[in-house]
């Protein structure tokens, strides 16, 4: 039985639209059929929850409706987004994993992927 | 600030049932899951119970699996954990604990006392 | 399951001593491991939790360490406050055990 382990990147920098993607991946030690994936952010050891998620193997991620987060699973490979983001949401973001189904339930954690986020410059006013 | 108080304890007779509940505050309860663990007279602590968000997965120590039913209430921000065929060696202070963000049970209520004995 | 044991069950120390606890594993739990202090008639307060990271408001003087099977909960400089029994918890997969407790009273 192989121990629960979470990868994702050490490093990721945001588009200039403020998107930031990564994946997460898990080393299961059992079959799960249920799985949530929560998204937390560390900033000056605090942590925070970004979005949360779970689905059933197999089956495409729903996150609530106002979440600045979208993703999509692939066995054990989970491809998340996060939208809107800004200079000051540069930070750890952290990716938790949960076998929920069947038991035993599991916990994995990642080591964050430090997300760099640019304002970008304004445009500047031309003379016409 | 984050608070949670049990109520629900007292004595009851070996075999019967007895029902805890757990009023949480200051935190989105959804977004938690929720424990119980209980600390019999002079001894160490013991896992009860889990529940997790939306409710639909629970996970028990296998001293109470069979006999005890962890629930949970979102909207009424309330955690339950119902008690049946109620044994001597389930007396005990019963805390209701939130897990932590990341692992951890970062918040616990002062605790209720139930006692069997007949 | 997974079975935890603490050692020792009990130790004396006076203030200013460095003390340490160890904890062990059944089996490998990660840094999955929670460190927690209770006094006689309170509820337990969560020190450490993954292992090493300090929760918010626990003194600098608690530290945690270790990975796998085999963690220690480490007080620097005994104080008065510090007098109390100590758990451990793995929390990497259901049942969530605690270990037995180890009981830091005064020399």
């Known amino acids: 039985c192989k121990a629960m382990h979470v990868a994702q990147p050490a490093v990721v920098l945001a588009s200039s639209r403020g998107i930031a993607s990564f994946v997460c991946e898990y080393a299961s030690p059992g079959k799960a059929t249920e799985v949530r994936v929560t998204v937390l952010r560390q900033a000056d050891s605090q942590v925070t929850e970004v979005c949360a998620a779970t689905y059933m193997m197999g089956n495409e991620l729903t996150f609530l409706d106002d979440s600045i987060c979208t993703g999509t699973s692939s066995g054990n490979q989970v491809n998340l987004t996060i939208q809107g983001l800004r200079a000051m949401d540069t930070g750890l973001y952290i990716c938790k994993v949960e076998l929920m189904y069947p038991p035993p339930y599991y916990l994995g954690i990642g080591n964050g992927t430090q997300i760099y986020v640019i304002d970008p410059e304004p445009c500047p006013d031309s003379d016409f | 600030q984050v608070q949670l108080v049990e109520s629900g304890g007292g004595v009851v007779q070996p075999g019967r049932s007895l029902r805890l509940s757990c009023a949480a505050s200051?935190?989105?309860?959804?977004?938690?899951?929720m424990h119980w663990v209980r600390q019999a007279p002079g001894k160490g602590l013991e896992w009860v119970a889990v529940?997790?968000?939306?409710?639909?997965?629970?996970y028990y120590a296998d001293s109470v699996k069979g006999r005890f039913t962890i629930s949970r209430d979102n909207s009424k921000n309330t955690l339950n954990l119902q008690m049946n065929s109620l044994r001597a060696e389930d007396t005990a202070v019963y805390y209701c604990?939130?897990?932590?963000?990341?692992?951890?049970?970062?918040?616990w209520g002062q605790g209720t006392l139930v006692t069997v004995s007949s | 399951d997974i079975q935890m044991t603490q050692s020792p069950s009990s130790l004396s120390a006076s203030v200013g001593d460095r003390v340490t606890i160890t904890c062990r594993a059944s089996?490998?739990?990660?840094?999955?491991l929670n460190w927690y202090q209770q006094k006689p008639g309170k509820a337990p307060k969560l020190l450490i939790y993954?292992?090493?990271s300090l929760q918010s408001g626990v003194p600098s003087r608690f530290s945690g360490s270790g990975s796998g099977t085999d963690f220690t909960l480490t007080i620097s400089s005994l104080q008065p406050e510090d007098f109390a029994t100590y758990y451990c918890?793995?929390?990497?997969?259901?049942?969530?055990?605690f270990g037995p407790g180890t009981k830091v009273d005064i020399k």
């Open positions: 089996q490998s739990i990660s840094s999955y």
């Open positions: 604990a939130r897990a932590g963000i990341l692992t951890g049970l970062d918040y």
């Open positions: 200051g935190f989105t309860f959804s977004r938690y899951g």
């Open positions: 918890q793995q929390s990497y997969s259901t049942p969530f055990t």
């Open positions: 529940i997790w968000y939306d409710g639909n997965n629970k």
């Open positions: 993954a292992a090493s």
